[in-house]
Every structure is written in C-alpha cells, then in structure tokens.
Amino acid sequence: RLVHMTVVSGSNVTLNISESLPENYKQLTWFYTFDQKIVEWDSGKSKYFESKFKGRVRLDPQSGALYISKVQKEDNSTYVMRVLKDGYEQEWKIKLQVLDPVPKPVIKIEKDVDDNCYLKLSCVIPGESVNYTWYGELPKEIQNSVLETTLKPHKHSRCYTCQVSVSSKNGTFCFSPPCTAARS
C-alpha cells in the first residue's frame, strides 16, 4: 500500500490513509524512513521521539493522521504508519515529495503575430524543471514550454494561459483582432 503525495514547501501537511484503522488496535507508530520513529501511540498515550519533526507534528489517534507543519524539502521521504493489533502488524506507506513554490511564469513573445496570424510564445520559469500546460483556443492542451499556433481570422480578443505545475501559478498573453498583441 503506497500513496504518493506532492506538496509545496512551507505548507502544512496531513499524512493519512484512505481506509479506516483496525478497531481496538494496540499500537500505532509513524516512521520517517525505515528506522526513525516520529511518534508512537500505545496504551492511550502518544510518545513523540527526538527527531527533526519534534514540535512540528501531531498525531490524531482516532484516524491515525499525522499533521506536519511547515514542511521543507528535507522532509522528502517515505513515511510509514504501522498499526499493531493482536500480535500482527499492518503497514501503510506514503511517499512525500516536497517541492519549492514556483514563481509566476514569464511569457516571452518569440515570434509576434503577423499578417498570417502566426504566434510563437515561450513560457519560462528561471532555473526550474517543471511541467507546463497551455490553455486557450487550441486544438488540444499543449504540455510544452513553447506554444506555436496559426490563428484563424477572428473578431474577439484571445488569451493563452501558461500554467506551471506544483503551485498552479500561471501567466497569460492576450491579443485583440485582427492580430495585434494587446497585453501580457
């Protein structure tokens, strides 16, 4: 049972499982990597271990959820929740990926609209390797940092939006008919 989670650094995170916990379990432990305990609930008490999470985590014994505040990139790891009942254990793994927030993208006009209404735009995030998606009046979503398109004659303004993954920040380029760049 492995769940993947991607979050932005600085945010608060809840690590939990989609299913309900075994009834009347004896012990519940959260691990960071395979050998470091974060917190253990046993005999009605929660014990928080000396770790980089001390003071940043809280366990909800009812749901088994682990709340981590202000996650950092160094918190990237596989977290494991182990539940012990009747001398047998179960494990759930959560692979947490912490990414830095992405700044607002800059849209560069590499080839301006001309009489043929040909347009080439590039969407740039300095020093980041992220996923790009272009939205607008396009035949299909373009998942690339560069948008190239030939526009049909039109009467209304058109906008193309570049969205970068992780923080869902976006930049928009608009122009008005017939084919003049209006704003970006």
């Epitope: 050998d35 596989t78 494991v80 012990l84 494990e91």
Partner: antibody, heavy 120, light 107 residues
Framework: QVQLVQSGAEVKKPGASVKVSCKAS????????MHWVRQAPGQGLEWMGG????????SYNQKFTGRATLTVDKSTSTAYMELSSLRSEDTAVYYC?????????????WGQGTLVTVSS | DIQMTQSPSSLSASVGDRVTITCKAS??????VAWYQQKPGKVPKLLIY???TRHTGVPSRFSGSGSGTDFTLTISSLQPEDVATYYC?????????FGQGTKLEIK
C-alpha cells in the same frame, strides 16, 4: 518461496576489505528492508546494519559506522555488505536477513551465511 | 543502545521438562521482542515475535510472554530436537540488539 543466497567463503589479510553479496528471490526486493547480522565463532548474534533497497537509506550499528557499507543493486535484487580495515576479530559468519515488514526488523528469512576468515 | 540480558547462559533439562528462558531489556521496548532458535551449524530460526506471537510452523510447545523490560520464552515439554541456542532480540529501537544467548542441552 523467499530465498537469500550469499556468496562463498572468503579468506582475507588484516587491513583488507571484503564484499559479501546476498541475492534475493521469491518476493519484491524493494518492499522489505535487508539487514546484516554477524556471528563470531562460538559467539552470539550481532546486528551490523540495514538498508532500504527502494531508496538506499541505511541504518548502521555505530560499532561499524565508517567500516561497513551497505548497498543494493535493484536490477539484480542483490544486497551487498562491504567491510573494510579487517582485523582478526572480524572473523565471523556474516548473514543477510530480510525484515518481515519494512519497519519491523525481525528476521524470518536468512541467507545461508558467509564465513569470512581474517588471518595473516 | 538497549542491552538485552538473557538468563541463564546455559541450562540442562530432561525430555518432557518445562523450560523457561528469560530476557531483560535495559529500557522499555514494549512488546517488540523476538525469540530465535539456532541449532549447531545452522541459520537462526524465528520462533516468536511481538513477545508472544508464534511464527508460522512453530510447535505450540513454544510460547512467549512479557512486555516492557521483562520477557520469557517457555518450552512446555522439552523435546530432543529442541537442543539449540536461543536468542532474544529487541526491534523497538535502532540499533537492533540481541541477547547473548542461552544454550539448552538435554540431561
């Protein structure tokens, strides 16, 4: 069925290094941590360290930190234990042992053992 | 590190006897204790885990008990094939540690 097959016996001189391999089969190699336990002649069991084959994360007995190196080759489902700066007290049978759960290092599956003899 | 102290270090008993081996942890390990049997020249074999859960295929004459710092392995009726060295192990906290072993012989 789960099988752990270790490399053959080794004779080494003091100061040398030894690398013991442990080939796993019968289960998904990356889903369980692998550990190394040694046993000197007529002595008890001593845990050396463990490794998560999925990420390469390791945990060592402080006694062996700096001298023991645990690695894995996921493509061949093989775990390795290298021990450097060997001395006569390192003469022992070295076992690889698979944890029953990722976070529960008790050992239901063991390799057959590799005898390492350190002698000048 | 958590020390696991076994007693006795060796014992001799007759076939049919009830045999008890104890293990004391230097600090609370909950129930994260396993017991192993190792016959001469063989690989250790898991008998008990979580202090009292018998591993698959282990005869019912073997039982474990205890929690916190004091643990016991009991063989209710000793059989000739039980001649071996028995080890306790704690897996509550890294580094993992074993007891020094108890060598069991038949009288």
């Amino acid at each position: 069925q789960v099988q752990l097959v270790q490399s053959g016996a080794e004779v080494k001189k003091p100061g040398a290094s030894v690398k013991v391999s442990c080939k796993a089969s019968g289960y998904t190699f990356t889903e369980y941590t692998m550990h190394w336990v040694r046993q000197a002649p007529g002595q008890g069991l001593e845990w050396m360290g463990g490794i998560n084959p999925d990420t390469g994360d390791t945990s060592y007995n402080q006694k062996f930190t700096g001298r023991a190196t645990l690695t894995v080759d996921k493509s061949t489902s093989t775990a390795y234990m290298e021990l450097s700066s060997l001395r006569s007290e390192d003469t022992a049978v070295y076992y690889c042992a698979r944890a029953q759960f990722w976070t529960t290092p008790r050992f239901a599956y063991w390799g057959q053992g590799t005898l390492v003899t350190v002698s000048s | 590190d958590i020390q696991m102290t076994q007693s006795p270090s060796s014992l001799s008993a007759s076939v049919g006897d009830r045999v008890t081996i104890t293990c004391k942890a230097s600090q609370d390990v909950g129930t994260a204790v396993a017991w192993y049997q190792q016959k001469p020249g063989k690989v250790p074999k898991l008998l008990i885990y979580w202090a009292s859960t018998r591993h698959t295929g282990v005869p019912s004459r073997f039982s474990g008990s205890g929690s916190g710092t004091d643990f016991t392995l009991t063989i209710s009726s000793l059989q000739p094939e039980d001649v071996a060295t028995y080890y306790c192990q704690q897996y509550s906290t890294y580094p993992i540690t074993f007891g020094q072993g108890t060598k069991l012989e038949i009288k």
